[in-house]
Interface confidence: medium
């Protein structure tokens, strides 16, 4: 039978009844244009929602936006555009909330075409109230955050100047004019390219890169002859041009860019192009792109300075510059990611890694799922996930991957179950143990979110009719209750549900159509009666992350340590509640081979774990060195794995060796840098 | 009903050598990692040695490193620990015990007796 | 290595007193602790494990609390049959290590 009508299924008693009691139906006096939501603060309730409407006239478009707020998680909103003076806001910046629970907000106007500059609205207390200012400038970007002051704003203008705030907007000034790119790294500090010729685009691969920390009163230029940057975890990148010829190469700092050293990643010619695809404080995922149109590159994976790689993963799906990919971070689970590799036949097949990339896998079969067509071997296949590409690709996939932090081991996703990712209307998996077995969920597409910290789970079917049924299941989607919200159907446009899964408010948004006008409607359920008590000891049980033996003591070892986590069983119907934190208690595992990478100049034999030294290191790999202050690198040709926590057991000693003699480079020097002062 | 049976105890001159073993029976002993725990006389417990249950991995405490050997046959449900270049503080009532996944040692031998003496 | 200290070394109580025994460690340990029985003649028997849990099959008046250094095993209501010594061990990394032990006597 399909998931969800066995025998077992044990109903939610009374759920019609006490979900009619907590279902809060919205009308919002609006013709249908776009409606865009955000949440201001955690765990405050309260919700801005902005719809525009554009009625094209003959000569401009006229716009009308409207603001709501709402401080019961959408339960109730109120009209509040009389506050931002019934003005026209700008969908494309979208609304600025600030960082944490600063309670700040910042809403960019639309002005007329003859202005001095531009307008925001801004609020400090949770969009209770807006203060209009005008600015001595047009914005080209959405106002950026300092991520440790949330007075401290910075705006890219339209004539590429740099503009920074110190007093949450209030007054404005230009520290730096000829600005492709501005972005906040720690402690304040603003990066950002500089042009000195033309255009942003005409000096691409001649920008300086400059840096501030005392925003805008002294700068230092970093790097010269730079094509892009980026900022991931401790890690400041830039690629650079080489001297003699259009490739360019990745080099890196952890000092905020006093010192660079190259990264020991191929360089990369005009047309490709290197991509962070994820970056903590120990390492860093690099996507580099193959020659040509492939469509395809490969993963490497940084050791804890960001300089020495490891080829993490060939073959890896990523479509042109800024393209698609399909590379999920699993939060559920630590060590777990999830992305798409283009295989010689053209195919699309989803590969898992548990350790950080250090050895990828196909997904295993779901139990309960039969091989599709794509398999040549109907008893032998994997489960292929839809993500990003697939949703570019308009396949009929409404929602990416889904996972959790507090929501430990679960995953949902979009997925169909063969060889290949198939382009057949695919179903709803789910994973509660972090991605080693799967179930199917749902059949067909669906949206889904998880509430409640995994307590609940609900789900739409995406269809092309109005819809009316919402899914919920209290035990991590193996049984599921239907609930019809509304009489009367809705055009179903999306599920918004509070970040961070802590919420048991779910809102369902459409619009309803009638002969003559079309309307914005929500409707927000509070699954609080459904788990009626709150969670206790009893509803708990132990798990063991990653387990795959459960009987060994090894078991469950990644990145050099255990975790068990106390998980909520799935037969308990209860409330984790907002304050829920997910207990865990790691142990240390002993130290194997396992939990070293090969140092530069060192690499892995195929089938040994033993890193051993490269006969010469000749041609272009001679580029591949560490610099600094210091030339020369010291190594035992062993280095931990970033984030290895591992203690003991195995200890790699090596003979010391200077590879000073085997260096040659030109790189971001620091006599190539200099300082001035406003 | 599980059990844990050690043997193998008995006098040794110092320097000399003794194997200890420990029948397994009433579990899957194939799927436990299996510890070494000794107890000397009106001393506290310490611990040995532990093996994984594929027996790929053995970890010993300092004190018996590169002396002892912890290891194990699955086709026979036993454990065995070779001890070497014994000396008089290796005096102790030597227990198995086994070692689920959550590293706990949940079930014990009676223990045997190892004396080193001139 | 990580030192385990137990207290008290011995106590004297009688049937149905709550009898409390704790164990510091030397260094944070979460909660990788188990609490062992040992009675004359007989095998050790594991209790406690993860500093809560209490092994299928022991009576419900065990139970352990505490995380990161500091453990409690509570005996609620001493029986007859618990006059024995109890031990505590952590296993958060190795060598694995002991407590010296608390001894239950009848007073």
């Known amino acids: 039978s399909a998931p969800g009508e066995d025998e077992e299924c044990g109903r939610v008693r009374d759920f019609v009844a006490k979900l009619a009691n907590n279902t809060h139906q919205h009308v919002f006096d609006d013709l249908r244009g776009s409606v865009s939501l955000s949440w201001v603060g955690d765990s405050t309730g309260v919700i801005l929602v902005l719809t525009t409407f554009h009625v094209p006239l003959v000569i401009m478009t006229f716009g009308q936006s409207k603001l709501y707020r709402s401080e019961d998680y959408g339960k109730n909103f109120k009209d509040i555009t009389d506050l931002i003076n019934n003005t026209f806001i700008r969908t494309e910046f979208g609304m600025a909330i600030g960082p944490e629970n600063s309670g700040k907000v910042v809403l960019t106007a639309e002005v007329s075409g003859g202005s001095r500059g531009g307008r925001i609205f801004r609020s400090s207390d949770f969009a209770k109230n807006f203060v209009q200012t005008d600015l001595p400038f047009h914005p080209l970007t959405q106002m950026m955050y300092s991520p440790q002051n949330s007075d401290y704003l910075l705006a890219l203008s339209t004539e590429n100047g740099l503009w920074v705030s110190k007093n949450f907007g209030g007054k404005w000034e230009e520290i730096h004019k000829a600005v492709c790119l501005a972005k906040w790294g720690s402690d304040n500090t603003i990066f950002f390219t500089t042009y000195a010729n033309g255009s942003c685009k005409a000096d691409l691969g001649a920008l300086e890169l400059w840096r501030t920390s005392d925003l805008g009163k002294s700068f230092k230029t970093i790097g010269v002859k730079i094509y892009s940057f980026g900022l991931g975890g401790r890690f400041l990148f830039a690629s650079v041009m080489a001297d003699k010829d259009t490739t360019r190469r990745i080099h890196v700092s952890t000092d905020q860019g006093d010192t660079w050293s190259m990264a020991q990643l191929p360089s990369v010619g005009q047309e490709q192009f290197y991509s962070i695809l994820a970056a903590n404080d120990d390492m860093v995922f690099m996507h580099v792109d193959e020659p040509g149109d492939t469509g395809f590159g490969t993963i490497f994976t940084s050791d804890d300075r960001g300089i020495v790689y490891s080829k993490s993963l060939d073959r890896h799906l990523y479509t042109t510059t800024g393209g698609e990919t399909d590379f999920t971070n699993v939060t559920s689970l630590r060590g777990v990611y999830i992305t798409s590799v283009l295989s010689e036949d053209n195919s699309i097949q989803t590969m898992i890694t548990f350790d950080q990339g250090g050895r990828w896998t196909h997904l295993r079969k779901p139990e309960n799922s039969e091989c599709d067509a794509t398999a040549k071997n109907k008893n032998e296949c994997s489960l292929h996930i839809h993500a990003s590409y697939s949703i570019s690709q308009k396949l009929n996939v409404p929602m990416a991957p889904l996972s959790e932090p507090n929501a430990v081991g679960i995953v949902i996703a979009h997925g169909s179950v063969g060889d290949a990712i198939s382009v057949m209307v695919p179903d709803v998996y789910i994973s509660d143990d972090g991605g080693y077995s799967w179930t199917k969920m749902l059949e067909g597409p669906h949206y889904y979110t998880i509430l409640d910290s995994g307590g609940i789970i609900v789900a739409i079917e995406h269809s092309s009719r109005p819809i009316n049924v919402i899914k919920f299941s209290t035990d991590e989607g193996q049984c599921w209750q239907t609930y019809t919200f509304t009489r009367d159907p809705i055009y179903f446009t999306g599920l918004a549900s509070e970040p961070g899964a802590r919420s048991m408010n779910i809102s369902i948004w459409g619009f309803t159509e009638s002969f003559l006008t079309s309307q914005w409607v929500s409707y927000t359920i509070d699954f609080k009666d459904i788990l009626e008590r709150n969670c206790e000891e009893k509803d708990y049980t132990i798990w063991l992350a990653h387990s795959t033996d459960p009987e060994d003591y090894e078991d469950g070892c990644i990145l050099g340590y255990k975790e068990q986590f106390l998980r909520l069983r799935k037969s308990s119907v209860c409330q984790n509640g907002r304050d829920y934190v997910v207990t865990k208690q790691p142990s240390i595992c002993l130290c194997s081979l396992e939990d070293f990478l090969c140092d530069f100049g060192y690499y892995r034999p195929e089938n040994d774990s033993k890193c051993v030294e490269q006969p010469e290191l000749k041609g272009h790999d001679l580029e591949f060195c560490l610099y600094g202050r210091e030339e020369h690198l010291t190594t035992n040709g062993y280095r931990k794995i970033p984030g290895d926590k591992c203690q003991g057991g195995v200890n790699p000693v090596r003979e010391v060796k200077d590879l000073k003699k085997k260096c040659t480079s030109n790189f971001l020097s620091p006599e190539k840098q200099n300082s001035k002062s406003n | 009903e599980v059990q844990l049976v050690e043997s193998g105890g008995g006098l040794v001159q110092p320097g000399g050598s003794l194997r200890l073993s420990c029948a397994a029976s009433?579990?899957?002993?194939?799927?436990?990692?299996m510890s070494w725990v000794r107890q000397a006389p009106g001393k506290g417990l310490e611990w040995v040695a532990i093996?994984?249950?594929?027996?790929?991995?053995?970890y010993y405490s300092d004190t018996v490193k590169g002396r002892f050997t912890i290891s194990r046959d699955n086709s026979k449900n036993s454990l065995y620990l070779q001890m070497n270049s014994l000396r008089a503080e290796d005096t102790a009532v030597y227990y198995c015990?086994?070692?689920?996944?959550?590293?706990?040692?949940?079930?014990w031998g009676q223990g045997t007796l190892v004396t080193v003496s001139s | 290595d990580i030192q385990m200290t137990q207290s008290p070394s011995s106590l004297s109580a009688s049937v149905g007193d709550r009898v409390t025994i704790t164990c510091h460690a030397s260094?944070?340990?979460?909660?990788?602790i188990g609490w062992l029985q040992q009675k004359p003649g007989k095998a050790f028997k594991g209790l406690i494990y993860?500093?809560?849990n209490l092994k299928d099959g022991v009576p419900s008046r065990f139970s352990g609390s505490g995380s990161g250094a500091d453990f409690t095993l509570t005996i609620s209501s001493l029986q007859p049959e618990d006059f024995a010594t109890y031990f505590c061990?952590?296993?958060?990394?190795?060598?694995?290590?002991f407590g010296g032990g608390t001894k239950v006597e009848i007073r």
């Open positions: 015990s086994r070692s689920s996944s959550h590293w706990y040692f949940d079930v």
């Open positions: 260094q944070g340990i979460s909660s990788n």
């Open positions: 009433g579990f899957t002993f194939s799927t436990y990692g």
């Open positions: 993860h500093g809560t």
């Open positions: 061990v952590q296993y958060a990394q190795f060598p694995y290590t």
């Open positions: 093996i994984s249950s594929g027996g790929s991995y053995t």
